[in-house]
């Protein structure tokens, strides 16, 4: 999956948008969609959205989940609709490639 990197000028996908950066919109258009979970003072804050530019999300999507944050990325229209990011459980390893889904 790692080798199948999208090109910078690839097509745009429609993504579900939920979170602080979405304004009044419930969708956005970008080269990748994402679903994230961050822990804010012990409270789970889920967000969904898109990266307009592939390079913008490349590092984020490759970052393994930590105890305080997890991001899952995908490509395809509405591909993040049914993705819920999850924090790592003890004893599990999370290579960055596991968090990237191509549709």
């Amino acid at each position: 999956v790692e080798d199948e990197k999208p090109k910078v000028n690839q097509k745009l996908y429609m993504c579900v948008c939920e979170g602080l950066s979405c304004g009044n919109e419930d969708h956005c258009e970008g080269q990748q969609c994402f679903s994230s979970l961050s822990i804010n003072d012990g409270f789970h804050v889920y967000q969904k959205g898109c990266f307009q530019v592939y390079e913008q999300g490349k590092m984020t999507c490759k970052t393994p989940p930590s105890p305080g944050q997890a991001v899952e990325c995908c490509q395809g229209d509405w591909c993040n609709r049914n993705i819920t990011a999850q924090l790592p459980t003890k004893g599990k390893s999370f290579p960055g490639t596991q968090n990237f889904h191509l549709e």
Partner: antibody, heavy 118, light 106 residues
Framework: EVQLVETGGGLVQPGRSLKLSCVAS????????MYWIRQAPGKGLEWISS????????YYPDSVKGRFAISRDNAENTVYLQMNSLRSEDTATYYC???????????WGQGTLVTVSS | DIQMTQSPSLLSASVGDRVTLSCKAS??????LNWFQQKLGEAPKLLIY???SLQTGIPSRFSGSGSGTDFTLTISSLQPEDVAIYFC????????FGPGTKLELK
């Protein structure tokens, strides 16, 4: 049925310490973040502390940071709040609460009253 | 820190009335907002989570709406058992509660 029972409240002098306990039942305790929230008499609610599932991450507002410490014993299904250097403004009912990942503070205990007075 | 304000602080209404309570955040919190009901001498009880989702077991006369900075809790037909204080709570950043709205019967 989810149950949270707080104990350990009482009258304590300013500057002294007190440790509250919250015993949980009706759910798999070790799978859930836990919280302490307090309410001064006749006043509003204030989030005091959070702890993650294994106790490795704890969170506090500035008002209690450095004085209060949350901990948990998953074997005993219990979360604790160690309160040091107590002040009169810490007088409140202290509630234990739990979340599900999607639903913050979904369940609360009945609370335990802490009175800080000389 | 994000400040939460609620209005009115006291609301008198009659049984059967449609009641609307307001909660405002000092900055964008998207939908990361809950509503709690606290009856006299009891612990708070969760009514609404994520701005508009009804908690299991809560009567359908309660509903929530809003996103960003402005939120509303609506009781479609007030019942005597709804007399309580209602608090909003944001968990977007630095979790904070609103000061509450006391709801009483006229």
């Amino acid at each position: 049925e989810v149950q949270l029972v707080e104990t350990g409240g009482g009258l304590v002098q300013p500057g002294r310490s007190l440790k509250l306990s919250c015993v949980a039942s009706g759910f798999t305790f070790s799978n859930y973040y836990m919280y302490w929230i307090r309410q001064a008499p006749g006043k509003g609610l204030e989030w005091i502390s959070s702890i993650n599932t294994d106790g490795g991450s704890t969170y506090y507002p500035d008002s209690v940071k450095g004085r209060f410490a949350i901990s948990r014993d998953n074997a005993e299904n219990t979360v604790y709040l160690q309160m040091n250097s107590l002040r009169s403004e810490d007088t409140a009912t202290y509630y234990c609460a739990k979340s599900t990942p999607n639903i913050p503070l979904a369940y609360w205990g009945q609370g335990t009253l802490v009175t800080v007075s000389s | 820190d994000i400040q939460m304000t609620q209005s009115p602080s006291l609301l008198s209404a009659s049984v059967g009335d449609r009641v609307t309570l307001s909660c405002k955040a000092s900055q964008n919190i998207y939908k990361y907002l809950n509503w709690f009901q606290q009856k006299l001498g009891e612990a708070p009880k969760l009514l609404i989570y994520y701005s508009n989702s009804l908690q299991t077991g809560i009567p359908s006369r309660f509903s929530g709406s809003g996103s960003g900075t402005d939120f509303t809790l609506t009781i479609s037909s007030l019942q005597p058992e709804d007399v309580a204080i209602y608090f909003c709570f944001q968990y977007s950043s630095g979790p904070t509660f609103g000061p509450g709205t006391k709801l009483e019967l006229k």
